[in-house]
Interface confidence: medium
């Protein structure tokens, strides 16, 4: 989750990640070009609520200050760990040209060529080592290894990095061997659910644009609000059908049949007081989808959820009621009422897929995660467009840890707050070709909402 160039003994000891941009060693953060400056990391100091009651026990508190307290602060539309890139939605050498908004479309409406580009890009991301970032394999206190001289890091592929980010946001706090503190989640069960997953997808989309050399590459979405008992993207033409001889595995006719998963052995990491190190841990699995005749959410569920005008409500947790966020996440019923026995929308779609996709720490291993969350984000975006909320709609304090408005989303780096992603998709350089009105449009006639 940190730039490779910063994970040196000096960088870790000095807690400073302000790399130079280009060959000029003094051009830290693109400073000589006016792109940014090395600055003190700002973190949210307001109180949080919820079940995490410890203090200074977790690497992710005050993120990312346990690791780096000085990072590049980019000016204008510049972005990136060395201010060498542009903010989402901007392009050009000076990042002052608005990029034409890319269009995220229903996966079923892609042409054969577009479908191949998407699936090929995912496969390429699974096989390509990330050029700039590494993952940490030990906790903050053990980050320099047993001798205190060797940063404990590992290379991993672009897609596995995407998986690791999700794992790290939900992993337990480790208090010692086999002593996990589980009451913590930086990307679910609170308002940050929508912004965290939005940034997560934007990150992957940008990586896939870079890998494919196509700046207008867009992630498709899976409209899971069909009310059916089948996964219509689980086919060999799309994200892989079930294997005949072992339906928990993916058909050999799909490129995803060979995908191995990372970050699945949570109990093992807890026992060894370590972090997921990107080692492959077996094949991707989807147990029988829609077990017990479970059905996917319906379009009516989506519409009910969109009719909730309050973004979130106290205690900003999984028991919030009449909260758009909690209904979308799926802890509330779609109409905003609470029924702890019921899963809905996003949660129901994950549960329906069973297998790897049903466990938060490993869910992102399954490429269905990408298109599932793309649709979840489309619902969030529709709500934003309908309600045009001010930032005050987001709690400044007393949300669970990681979920206050100004908290830096864990473990994204350089730091980015929830507030920075509480914008319409268009402001971030993309749009959805989706119609979430009463009549469900056939996939061949999608319209821009």
């Amino acid at each position: 989750q940190f730039p490779r160039v910063c994970m040196t003994l000096d960088g870790v000891l000095n807690k400073e990640c302000c790399p130079p941009l280009g060959p000029e060693a003094t051009n830290i953060c693109g400073f000589l070009e006016g792109r940014g400056q090395c600055a003190e990391v700002q973190t949210d100091t307001r109180p949080w609520s919820g079940p995490y009651i410890l203090r200074n026990q977790d690497d992710r508190e005050q993120w990312p200050r346990k690791f780096f307290n000085r990072t590049c602060k980019c000016t204008g539309n510049f972005a990136g760990y060395n201010c060498g890139g542009c903010k989402f939605g901007w392009t050009g050498p000076d990042c002052n040209r608005k990029k034409p908004a890319i269009l995220r479309r229903n996966i079923h409406s892609l042409t054969a060529q577009e479908r191949e580009q998407f699936l090929g890009a995912l496969d390429l991301a699974k096989k390509s080592i990330h050029p700039d970032y590494v993952i940490t394999t030990q906790h903050w206190l053990g980050l320099l290894g047993p001798n205190g001289t060797q940063p404990q890091i590992a290379n991993c592929s672009v897609y596995d990095f995407f998986v690791w980010l999700h794992y790290y946001s939900v992993r337990d706090t480790l208090l010692g061997p086999g002593r996990p503190y589980k009451a913590i989640d930086f990307s679910h069960q609170g308002p940050a659910f929508v912004t965290w997953h939005r940034y997560h997808l934007l990150w992957l989309e940008r990586e896939l644009q870079r890998l494919t050399g196509n700046e207008s590459f867009a992630l498709p979405y899976w409209n899971f609000a069909t009310g059916k008992n089948e996964c219509d993207v689980c086919t060999d033409e799309l994200l892989g059908a079930a294997r005949q001889d072992d339906p928990t595995l993916i058909s050999r006719n799909s490129r995803f049949s060979t995908w191995e998963i990372v970050c699945d052995s949570l109990d093992d990491y807890n026992r060894r007081v370590t972090l997921c190190n990107g080692t492959y841990e077996g094949l991707l699995r989807r147990n029988k989808v829609g077990r017990n005749n479970e059905k996917l959410p319906t379009l009516k569920n989506v519409q009910d959820c969109l009719s909730l005008q309050k973004f979130d409500s106290p205690p900003f947790f999984q028991n919030s009621t009449f909260s758009f966020r909690n209904a979308l996440e799926g802890f509330d019923k779609a109409d905003g009422t609470l029924d702890s026995q019921v899963m809905n929308l996003h949660n129901l779609a994950h549960s329906f897929l069973n297998g790897t996709n049903a466990l938060p720490h490993s869910a992102a291993n399954d490429p269905v995660f990408v298109v599932l969350h793309s649709f979840t984000d489309a619902i969030f975006d529709e709500w934003l467009k309908r309600n045009n909320p001010s930032t005050d709609a987001w709690p400044q304090e007393l949300a669970p840890i990681g979920h206050n408005r100004m908290y830096n989303m864990v473990p994204f780096f350089p730091p980015v707050t929830n507030e920075e992603l509480f914008l319409t998709a268009e402001q971030l350089g993309y749009n959805y070709a989706v119609d979430l009105s009463e009549e469900e449009a056939p996939v061949w006639s999608t319209t821009l909402s």
């Epitope: 000095n14 060693a25 000589l32 006016g34 792109r35 400056q37 000085r70 204008g76």
Partner: antibody, heavy 122, light 107 residues
Framework: EVQLVESGGDLVKPGGSLKLSCAAS????????MSWVRQTPDKRLEWVAT????????YYPDSVKGRFTISRDNAKNTLYLQMSSLKSEDTAMYYC???????????????WGQGTSVTVSS | DIQMTQSPASLSASVGETVTITCRAS??????LAWYQQKQGKSPQLLVY???TLAEGVPSRFSGSGSGTQFSLKINSLQPEDFGSYYC?????????FGGGTKLEIK
């Protein structure tokens, strides 16, 4: 109390060299970037050089690049400015100043010394 | 290089008055601007950085505002110790440059 005391200013001939020093006290010198700023006889202020807290990074305007070298000795809490190939337009009061935020480099200077005078004339 | 243009070059005011000094950057410097005060025979002192953040120990009658290319320093209820010269300086990308200064004199 933060104190910066410059020394080494003198009258020097064009083409000559001079080394200025700045002794720092009252703060953790190694945590701060430092700069030299000069004030010309017509009272204009001109930034001359900056060095990062650890000494790894140095910055100069084009007007002095290649002629002036900023350096520091964190063990001695001292900042230096080595000036060579001096020109008449380098005549000024030279101030050493502390960068106001404890980052690698930040351009607002929160403490200044009393200055040392450099005159370049034949 | 970014040019900083200060106005007025000089200004006379009385104790208790409110004065405003402006500074214009030749290009967008966002909020990377500092203001300094210099009294006769003394070295400059930082008043404001990041366009509006008061430096430690600076009285609240001083306030900075602006972003992009237009900035101002306002001094409410002038005190005798406020007379002297004022300089703006951008701290965006190097080279950092200063304005030509504004001399504030007692009327």
């Amino acid at each position: 109390e933060v104190q910066l005391v410059e020394s080494g200013g003198d009258l020097v001939k064009p083409g000559g060299s001079l080394k200025l020093s700045c002794a720092a006290s009252g703060f953790t010198f190694s945590s701060y970037g430092m700069s030299w700023v000069r004030q010309t006889p017509d009272k204009r202020l001109e930034w001359v050089a900056t060095i990062s807290s650890g000494g790894s990074y140095t910055y100069y305007p084009d007007s002095v690049k290649g002629r002036f070298t900023i350096s520091r000795d964190n063990a001695k809490n001292t900042l230096y400015l080595q000036m060579s190939s001096l020109k008449s337009e380098d005549t000024a009061m030279y101030y050493c100043a502390r960068l106001g935020v404890t980052t690698v480099v930040h351009g607002a200077m929160d403490y200044w010394g009393q200055g040392t005078s450099v005159t370049v004339s034949s | 290089d970014i040019q900083m243009t200060q106005s007025p070059a000089s200004l006379s005011a009385s104790v208790g008055e409110t004065v405003t000094i402006t500074c214009r950057a030749s290009e967008n410097i966002y909020s990377y601007l500092a203001w300094y005060q210099q009294k006769q025979g003394k070295s400059p002192q930082l008043l404001v950085y990041n366009a509006k953040t008061l430096a430690e120990g600076v009285p609240s009658r001083f306030s900075g505002s602006g972003s992009g290319t237009q900035f101002s320093l306002k001094i409410n209820s002038l005190q005798p110790e406020d007379f002297g010269s004022y300089y703006c300086q951008h701290h965006y990308g190097t080279p950092w440059t200063f304005g030509g200064g504004t001399k504030l004199e007692i009327k």
